[in-house]
């Protein structure tokens, strides 16, 4: 059986067939004798009971309120009532875009990673017996597909697959032709799978400093959005009031990864800051990477090979 209409807020396009199906339908069949009522309220009108005489466009079945078709003035709140069961929906009917095969406000956006499998299936179970034909359009151009009953696209995504895909069902009811349209805006993006995070630059850095001066140690990494970058130093982090971790900066790369940088600022350098390890670590679910900085007094520079210095 078709799903009931569980969403409390619904937006539909004028001119299309539409239905509301309450969610105690199986229950309703068991108690055929129970009084079942549909109501509408909008603006000044409070709880007007609906019946086929209310409008030639409205049809009532066991569990369903049908609109043939739905129009702008159908906007409002709808209620189904049976014994102590009530279900409510808020219906918003929007204007159709007459210059396109779809209405922009009724588009469902989806993102697919390149090379990943995606599938669009055009099907409408509720109106199945009334549907004459169903077509699938890409950017309002009809796609020639084998299955005319339920057109389906199933493939590994390529960048040229990006676009607006519209399933259009054509159906007859009481001698009139209607169509129902559902459009997906498919965006194809680069592979978003996680990378192994890496710290940029040498693993061990000797930094020449002068006592009493300040130094900024910059730690940069290429990482995933959920990865973390942090500094470790001394016996207990934060015990030295002259050491400050600056706010982390992040920039997104074109591939959807992140370039992060975190600075450790050491002010009024003292003897206690020399020849100790200041470690910067990037951590992810895939593991960690660490690089170390050692502050060296400028006078002692001659003891260290030149290539290990950073500015």
């Amino acid at each position: 059986a078709e799903s009931c209409t569980s969403r409390p807020h619904i937006t539909v396009v004028e001119g299309e067939p539409f239905y509301l199906k309450h969610c105690s339908c199986s229950l309703a069949h068991e108690i055929e004798t129970t009084t079942k009522s549909w109501y509408k309220s909008s603006g000044s009108q409070e709880h007007v009971e609906l019946n086929p005489r209310s409008s030639s466009r409205i049809a009532l079945h066991d569990c369903v309120l049908e609109f043939w078709p739905v129009e702008l003035n159908d906007t409002g709140s709808y209620f189904f009532q049976m014994k102590n069961y009530t279900q409510k929906w808020k219906l918003n009917v929007i204007r159709r875009n007459k210059h396109s095969c779809f209405t922009e406000r009724q588009v469902t956006s989806k993102i697919v990673e390149v090379k990943k499998f995606f599938q669009i299936t055009c099907e409408n179970s509720y109106y199945q017996t009334l549907v004459n034909s169903t077509s699938l359009y890409k950017n309002c151009k009809k796609l020639l597909l084998e299955n005319n009953k339920n057109p389906t696209i199933k493939k590994n995504a390529e960048f040229e697959d990006q676009g607006y895909y519209s399933c259009v069902h054509f159906l007859h009811h009481n001698g009139k032709l209607f169509n129902i349209t559902k459009t997906f805006n498919i965006t194809i993006v680069e592979d978003r799978s996680n990378i192994v995070p890496v710290l940029l630059g040498p693993k061990l850095n000797h930094v020449a400093v002068e006592l009493g001066k300040n130094v900024r140690l910059n730690c940069s990494a290429l990482l995933n959005e959920e990865d973390v970058i942090y500094w470790m130093f001394g016996e207990e982090n934060g015990s030295d009031p002259n050491i400050h971790e600056e706010k982390e900066m992040r920039i997104m790369t074109p591939e959807g990864k992140w370039h992060a940088s975190k600075v450790l600022r050491i002010e009024n350098i003292g003897e206690s800051n020399l020849n100790v390890l200041y470690n910067c670590t990037v951590a992810s679910t895939g593991g960690t990477d660490t690089k170390s900085f050692i502050l060296v007094r400028k006078a002692d520079m001659a003891d260290i090979p030149g290539h290990v210095f950073t500015r």
Epitope: Q119, I120, E123
Partner: nanobody, 122 residues
Framework: EVQLVESGGGLVQAGGSLRLSCAAS????????IGWFRQAPGKEREEVSC????????RYADSVKGRFTISSDNAKNTVYLQIDSLKPEDTAVYYC???????????????WGQGTQVTVSS
């Protein structure tokens, strides 16, 4: 991060049964329907069954009606596919996928599992 993980596949004799599981995480289960698909070597992927988490409504491909049963445990965010009276032609990789459009209307399956292999020997 949205994840679908299938399990329960394996090698089974014709006439036997299997119960496949699809464990979902990273999204609100009640807002989605879960479809089961299969892909046999050299063939297209086909949808065999689907269940809407919101109201439990189901659907089956004609080729599996009566032998396949789909069910869900919303508390565990898991969908099951019970396969009975297995035939050699059921041999395939079985995938689960999620859709926010339900099982009965135009739908787009956006998240896919890695698949679980089912092999039926005669």
């Amino acid at each position: 991060e949205v994840q679908l993980v299938e399990s329960g596949g394996g090698l089974v004799q014709a006439g036997g049964s299997l119960r496949l599981s699809c464990a979902a995480s990273g999204f609100t289960f009640d807002d989605y329907a879960i479809g089961w698909f299969r892909q046999a070597p050299g063939k297209e992927r086909e949808e065999v069954s689907c269940i809407s988490s919101s109201d439990g409504s189901t659907r089956y491909a004609d080729s599996v009606k009566g032998r396949f049963t789909i069910s869900s445990d919303n508390a565990k965010n898991t969908v099951y596919l019970q396969i009975d009276s297995l035939k050699p032609e059921d041999t395939a990789v079985y995938y689960c996928a999620s859709t926010s459009e339900g099982c009965h209307d135009d739908r787009f399956y956006d998240y896919w599992g890695q698949g679980t292999q089912v092999t039926v020997s005669s």
